[in-house]
């Protein structure tokens, strides 16, 4: 079982534990070995104390366990004799946030440890490029995040503040859209979403390449490179090439780094180079026709980054075709 947790030690027998929504966590507690062990884990809110898990007289005692913890908690029973009173906590919810006290009594002494549990969520955000009529928009979206993240935008590496924020989920987790109107701009844009609790940051970068003018029947090379500043060598990522047409995106090619598999949805599409170094994902589109004119979007995404590169291709009739008309 993978347990996402950060341990922070603060004074007075108090620890801060950070877990992720829906995942499992261990609330740590240790004591000096002794006989006649009694363990009580309790949750304390502003008004009440709730029984989370109890152990005494040699077994777990769940008669008075609060229903919200049913089938979600257990102790490491084989390790109690070695001084381990830690609580294994399954399927964290945001309602589990708060102060937990672990009481341990033995024939020799009694101690109380306090654990502050904080729960975060950061489902991978995404950056989308949308065209609505004649307007172009960049949208930074995070489907599920808690606590509220810090969202910052940059244009050509300079911070900007004008963006339209939409938020749903009054208590959390939140779903957040931050939209920027980039109509007519050739600048590069960057959106950063930071979850301070989970110490997790995601960045989306959008770059508009110079327009490409090609003749019918020619081929075009569309560049898209993975920037090493953004991606670490062992990080899984995916590359999607798509075409934007009348506000609708259709996928042309898809590559997954974990399996190194490519799927092409357009037979005239191919990689510019062999994907040996997994950094250059430039594409060739052959045998251009007039209907190939439009915007081509390369999306390289990992858990931490999305790099969007836009190419505008203008396909013009060849001389022969023009004279035929």
């Amino acid at each position: 079982i993978f347990l996402s947790a950060f341990f922070t030690y603060v004074p007075m027998n108090e620890q801060i534990i950070i877990g992720r929504l829906g995942e499992d966590i261990i609330l740590p507690s240790s004591f000096e070995r002794g006989s006649e062990v009694v363990i009580h884990w309790k949750y304390q809110d502003s008004y009440n104390s709730y029984n989370v898990h109890s152990y005494y007289k040699g077994s777990g005692r769940l008669e008075s366990q609060d229903t919200r913890y049913a089938n979600r908690t257990s102790l490491f029973y084989n390790e109690i004799q070695n001084g381990n009173a830690s609580l294994f906590f399954r399927r964290l919810s945001l309602l589990d946030e708060g102060i937990y006290t672990c009481y341990v009594g033995t024939a020799i002494q009694a101690i109380t440890n306090k654990v502050v549990l904080k729960v975060g969520v950061f489902l991978t955000p995404m950056m989308k490029y949308e065209k609505r009529n004649t307007n172009s928009f960049l949208i930074c979206n995070v489907l599920s995040v808690y606590p509220r993240p810090i969202i910052t935008w940059k244009m050509d590496n300079t911070p900007i503040s004008e963006n339209n924020m939409q938020e749903t989920g009054s208590l959390g987790p939140f779903s957040i859209n931050s939209t920027l109107n980039i109509t007519g701009s050739n600048s590069s844009y960057e959106c950063t979403i930071e979850n301070s609790l989970l110490k997790q940051t995601w960045t989306g970068r959008w770059t508009m390449k110079d327009g490409l003018h090609k003749m019918q029947s020619e081929h075009v090379s569309l560049s898209c490179e993975l920037v090493n500043d953004y991606f670490s060598p062992n990080q899984d990522f995916k590359v999607t090439w798509s075409r934007m047409e009348s506000g609708i995106s259709s996928i042309l090619a898809y590559y997954l780094s974990s399996s190194q598999n490519t799927t092409f949805y357009e037979s005239r599409f191919s990689w510019n180079k062999e994907l040996k170094n997994q950094s250059d994902f430039s594409m060739n589109l052959t045998d251009l026709s007039l209907s190939d004119s439009g915007e081509y979007l390369c999306n390289i995404s990992s858990d931490e980054y999305t790099l969007l590169t836009i190419h505008t291709v203008h396909v013009e009739p060849s001389q022969e075709t023009a004279s035929d008309n």
Epitope: V38, S54, G105, A110
Partner: antibody, heavy 121, light 107 residues
Framework: QVQLVESGGGVVQPGRSLRLSCAAS????????IHWVRQAPGKGLEWVAV????????YYADSVRGRFTISRDNSKNTLSLQMNSLRAEDTAVYYC??????????????WGQGTLVTVSS | DIQMTQSPSTLSASVGDRVTITCRAS??????LAWYQQKPGKAPKLLIY???SLESGVPSRFSGSGSGTEFTLTISSLQPDDLATYYC?????????FGQGTKLEIK
């Protein structure tokens, strides 16, 4: 050293009320469950009630349930037993006794000297 | 409630004797049994917990054994200071109950 001192005993008429107190010292009061145990003159011991270390759980013997209420004030290191609707059979020396730990174990590592309650008309 | 029955009710023995007191539970209480000593006019004192664990500060001549429903308290060599009434108590479940006591006299 651990000390438990009971007070509040005396003579009371049947049907009346009495409140016993127990002052604790020499240990971290809020870490331990405390019990009341009584002993009728010339008789054996009878467990009366327990309150857990944090006051969250309270349990009573059948003979006193609904008439007696156990409570504690951890800020003052004191335990109380409110006894209502007293009967002649409640006549006894009342001891407060410290549980081995939270109150969940249920045996008594330390005892007070006791306070006598006599219910008589 | 679980009933606890002690035997004998009264026991007379000489200094140096090996003394055994028995306690029987009306149903299994595992090892959740304590023994107390009460001298006249005093509060009880814990001797043994969990059927056989000797409480700190209690002389080693006291020992306990048994599990389930049958338990014994043994004084290996009776001393004059052991004149008292002895009680067993189950703490397996609420309500906690005591045996009726065994009065130990010195011959």
């Amino acid at each position: 050293q651990v000390q438990l001192v009971e007070s509040g005993g005396g003579v009371v008429q049947p049907g009346r009320s009495l409140r016993l107190s127990c002052a604790a010292s020499g240990f971290t009061f809020s870490d331990y469950g405390i019990h009341w145990v009584r002993q009728a003159p010339g008789k054996g011991l009878e467990w009366v009630a327990v309150i857990w270390y944090d006051g969250s759980d309270k349990y009573y013997a059948d003979s006193v349930r609904g008439r007696f209420t156990i409570s504690r004030d951890n800020s003052k290191n004191t335990l109380s037993l409110q006894m209502n609707s007293l009967r002649a059979e409640d006549t006894a020396v009342y001891y407060c006794a410290r549980d081995r730990s939270s109150g969940a174990m249920g045996y008594f590592a330390y005892w007070g000297q006791g306070t006598l309650v006599t219910v008589s008309s | 409630d679980i009933q606890m029955t002690q035997s004998p009710s009264t026991l007379s023995a000489s200094v140096g004797d090996r003394v055994t007191i028995t306690c029987r539970a009306s149903q299994s209480i595992s090892s959740w049994l304590a023994w107390y000593q009460q001298k006249p006019g005093k509060a009880p004192k814990l001797l043994i917990y969990k059927a056989s664990s000797l409480e700190s500060g209690v002389p080693s001549r006291f020992s306990g054994s048994g599990s389930g429903t049958e338990f014994t308290l043994t004084i290996s060599s009776l001393q004059p200071d052991d004149l008292a009434t002895y009680y067993c108590q189950q703490y397996n479940s609420y309500s906690y109950t005591f045996g009726q006591g065994t009065k130990l006299e010195i011959k």
